[in-house]
């Protein structure tokens, strides 16, 4: 029960997050403009990452798209590129994630294969929240760089007569949505790894040795491990629960191969 | 068509108040920001105050600050302007205009109102 | 604040002449953001109330006539009218609609001769 609620509040936190993810990618106010020393302005700037956007006081509008490709700086390529990759990722591992998910059955599926599924999910879901988080703090870096420069330009063009206002940008709501957005995501990945660990199915499981008449070479493995004669194909690939409750120190003691996170 | 109609003006005394009302009419008053704008006799244009379409923003002339107060009643389409502590120097016609086109152009004007100040 | 200066105070031309007149702006009315000068011409006849006539520094509002052109970037505009005609007798002021508060010039008379 713990499993299946896992599993799907890692889904729906990844949902969320992916959601963050594209509207933070869509959203036009990556960068806006700093009001701090024109507080009254009556033009305002902000830009996202395919736009540029100017709002009027009057109320009117006007967006212009970033036409070039080759004219724009690496950073916003990267920045660009980064997103895409997290919303792809996320998108891939919340089409894997349905299909993992304990609460559906499809077909005869097994349970080791909607744990790897989960498994995968789970990745896919932390590198895709982590590309979200990158793409963010890079744009982020990108803008604390500019604004200390066109600081500096400023106050240092003050002589003349005429003073040009120059528009410094700081940030928009488009980066708060992205790192929380990318934060869920990632949250989400971790809930699906940890689900995972849970739908796995356990190996054979015994606390004592196994006896057979007429075994020689019995294999004695503590807790946790396969007990198998070496004769006989009926016992090969025969999986045996325990049914008994484990404690924590044993799980730890002897993890699965599900464990490697 | 658009029309804006100011009314309130009149003789007010030095020191005293006075409320200047705008009905506008023939577009979706709620969408835009209004200005007022005075002309004093034989002088130039001098813009006084400007409304956001919901109140969010408004700003004053240095000239008027602290003395008038900007409004407006958007369901019944109209703008105020509360003016306290008239000065001679406030005797002007007054204008309420929009901001209905781009580049903040004042596109539409009212026909203004009169205000004098005098003793 | 913004401060308009327009020159001359006032100008007399015979009608079709072509005339010019300036308006210096204290700071830069340029938005980086969209490329665009955010100064506006008005014209005002005796009598009349306020018109507007050019926005952005050059763009001419519909159904102004052509012979109106404005020019200029960041802090020096220019209203021209190319061959003046009667009706164009009025007061042009230049404003700013960059910041608050949205200050105007004092005003160029046209007088006819």
């Known amino acids: 029960m713990a499993v299946t609620a896992c599993q799907g509040l890692g889904f729906v936190v990844s949902l969320i997050g992916i959601a963050g993810i594209i509207a933070a990618t869509c959203m036009d106010q990556w960068s806006t403009q700093d009001l701090y020393n024109n507080p009254v302005t009556a033009v305002f700037n902000y830009q996202g990452l395919w736009r540029s956007c100017v709002r009027e006081s009057s109320g009117f509008t006007e967006c212009r798209g970033y036409f070039t490709l080759l004219g724009l700086p690496a950073m916003l390529q990267a920045v660009r590129a980064l997103m895409i990759v997290g919303i792809v990722l996320g998108a891939i591992g919340l089409l894997v994630s349905i299909f993992a998910l304990k609460c559906i059955r499809i077909g005869s599926m097994e349970d080791s294969a909607k744990a790897n599924m989960t498994l995968t999910s789970g990745i896919m879901f932390i590198v895709s929240g982590l590309c979200a988080i990158a793409g963010v703090s890079v744009f982020a870096n990108m803008l604390v760089t500019n604004f200390w420069m066109s600081t500096a330009n400023m106050y240092t063009g003050m002589g003349g007569m005429v003073q040009t206002v120059q528009t410094r940008y700081t940030f928009g709501a488009a980066l708060f949505v992205g790192w929380v957005a990318g934060g869920l995501t990632l949250i989400g990945g971790v809930m699906m790894c940890i689900a995972c660990r849970g739908l796995a199915p356990e190996e054979t499981n015994y606390k004592a040795v196994s006896y057979h008449a007429s075994g020689h070479s019995v294999a004695y493995k503590p807790g946790g491990f396969k007990a198998s004669t070496g004769f006989g194909s009926n016992t090969k690939n025969k999986k045996i629960y325990d049914g008994g409750a484990r404690t924590e120190d044993e799980v730890q003691s002897y993890p699965s191969k599900h464990d490697y996170v | 068509d658009v029309q804006l109609v100011e009314s309130g003006g009149g003789l007010v005394q030095p020191g005293g108040s006075r409320k200047l009302s705008c009905a506008a009419s023939?577009?979706?008053?709620?969408?835009?920001?209004m200005h007022w704008v005075r002309q004093a006799p034989e002088k130039g244009l001098e813009w006084v105050a400007y409304i956001s379409s919901g109140s969010g923003s408004i700003y004053y002339a240095d000239t008027v600050k602290g003395r008038f107060t900007l409004s407006r009643d958007n369901p019944k389409n109209t703008l105020f302007l509360q003016m306290t502590s008239l000065r001679s120097e406030d005797t002007a016609i007054y204008y309420c205009a929009t901001s209905y086109y781009y580049g903040n152009a004042l596109e539409y004007w009212g026909q203004g109102t009169s205000v004098t100040v005098s003793s | 604040d913004v401060v308009l200066t327009q020159s001359p105070s006032s100008l007399t031309v015979t009608e079709g002449e072509k005339v010019s007149m300036s308006c210096k702006s204290s700071?830069?009315?340029?938005?980086?953001?969209?490329?665009?000068?955010?100064l506006t011409w008005y014209q005002q006849k005796p009598g009349q109330t306020p018109t507007l006539l050019i926005y952005?520094?050059?763009t001419r509002k519909s159904g102004v006539p052509d012979r109106f052109t404005g020019s200029g970037s960041g802090t020096d505009f220019t209203l021209t009218i190319n061959t003046v005609q009667a009706e164009d007798l009025a007061v042009y002021y230049c404003?700013?609609?960059?910041?608050?508060?949205?200050?105007f010039g004092a005003g160029t008379k046209l007088d006819l001769k």
């Open positions: 404003q700013n609609v960059y910041s608050y508060p949205l200050t």
């Open positions: 952005w520094a050059s």
């Open positions: 023939g577009f979706t008053f709620s969408s835009f920001g």
């Open positions: 700071q830069s009315l340029f938005n980086l953001g969209n490329q665009k000068n955010y």
